[in-house]
Amino acid sequence: HNTTVFQGVEGQSLQVSCPYDSMKHWGRRKAWCRQLGEKGPCQRVVSTHNLWLLSFLRRRNGSTAITDDTLGGTLTITLRNLQPHDAGFYQCQSLHGSEADTLRKVLVEVLADPLDHRDAGDLWVPGESESFEDAHVEHSISRSLLEGEIPFPPTS
């Protein structure tokens, strides 16, 4: 799986979308999990409604919400009041039994609020020191960069 990068601004909301084949994943619940390192385990954050037919209903765990358009084939995760500690590697998953298929690997980047003047010298303009291989960037304002046009380095 390639990694899709979603960049949001600290304190604002970030919407992550995970498209999938609605026929292939018919009847399956979905989940959003946080991965502990690129090769580490993925810890469940929130999952869609226990009844698949009610997957369109928003479910929430803390500041993270999930909803599934099962007909259109789009899982949407919303991270409210984005904080630096929300940054990291995540997965959208399709559940079947005790197994989980990865729909999309996601890297969430939290950008400093440009309107926060606590220390203008610390404002982060994503650099070009090293691209995140095979990544695709989506900003919280829904502007997608072209493949390979990654404006920031990978993280640890």
């Epitope: 946080r34 390192g37 090769k39 580490g40 500690h85 590697f89 400093a112 650099g127 090293e130 993280t155």
Partner: antibody, heavy 120, light 107 residues
């Protein structure tokens, strides 16, 4: 028991090469990234590079590029670090270090260190 | 490369003291910072990952904070076994880089 066991101390002459091994037990190295970090006597820690044993991809610090080669043999769960064109300032303890990579790895294992002395 | 600057480079403290070590990154590194403890002749030991997360088995007197460029490691009540050298390491980009270390000595 999860551990990384490194090869023994080495004494080398300037211009020679050294190859240090790091054998993992209690876990599969394919599930981790293996890093190499060195520490000169009385000095701080210096990251040299890493390998993803799963696919053999490696990445090196610019300072060591062209002089260091990191490899891994998944059949023996062993990683190797070879440093060539040795000079006296390469005298250091070399550590291998396993983690799950970026984005908040909670796994962190270190070898016991291998002292490499470069002296004529 | 991202430069990591620790301060102080050394400090003397007594058992029971509250100790604070800071680490400054030359570029924004979000929360991708780890803190290590190293004792003479031993390998480093991970204390804190992702700026503020306590590694398994690490006593709760250790805590980390910060994001962006400025980070802090705090030992709330120094114990005899805490006398060691502490390093910060950034993982925002490769090459990973360490701070120069802070040696905590007995006063």
């Amino acid at each position: 028991q999860v551990q990384l066991v490194q090869s023994g101390a080495e004494v080398k002459k300037p211009g020679a090469s050294v190859k240090v091994s790091c054998k993992a037990s209690g876990f599969s190295i394919e599930d981790f990234y293996i890093h190499w970090v060195r520490q000169a006597p009385g000095q701080g820690l210096e990251w040299m590079g890493w390998i993803d044993p799963e696919n053999g991809e490696s990445k090196y610090a610019p300072k060591f590029q062209g002089r260091v080669t990191i490899t891994a043999d998944t059949s023996t769960s062993t990683a190797y670090m070879e440093l060539s064109s040795l000079r006296s300032e390469d005298t250091a303890v070399y550590y291998c270090h396993a983690d799950h990579g970026n984005y908040g790895s909670t796994m962190d294992y270190w070898g016991q260190g291998t002292l490499v002395t470069v002296s004529s | 490369d991202i430069q990591m600057t620790q301060s102080p480079s050394s400090l003397s403290a007594s058992v029971g003291d509250r100790v604070t070590i800071t680490c400054h990154a030359s570029q924004h590194i979000n929360v991708w910072l780890s803190w290590y403890q190293q004792k003479p002749g031993k390998a480093p030991k991970l204390l804190i990952y992702k700026a503020s997360n306590l590694h398994t088995g690490v006593p709760s007197r250790f805590s980390g904070s910060g994001s962006g460029t400025d980070f802090t490691l705090t030992i709330s009540s120094l114990q005899p076994e805490d006398f060691a050298t502490y390093y910060c390491q950034q993982g925002q980009t490769y090459p990973r880089t360490f701070g120069q270390g802070t040696k905590v000595e007995i006063k």
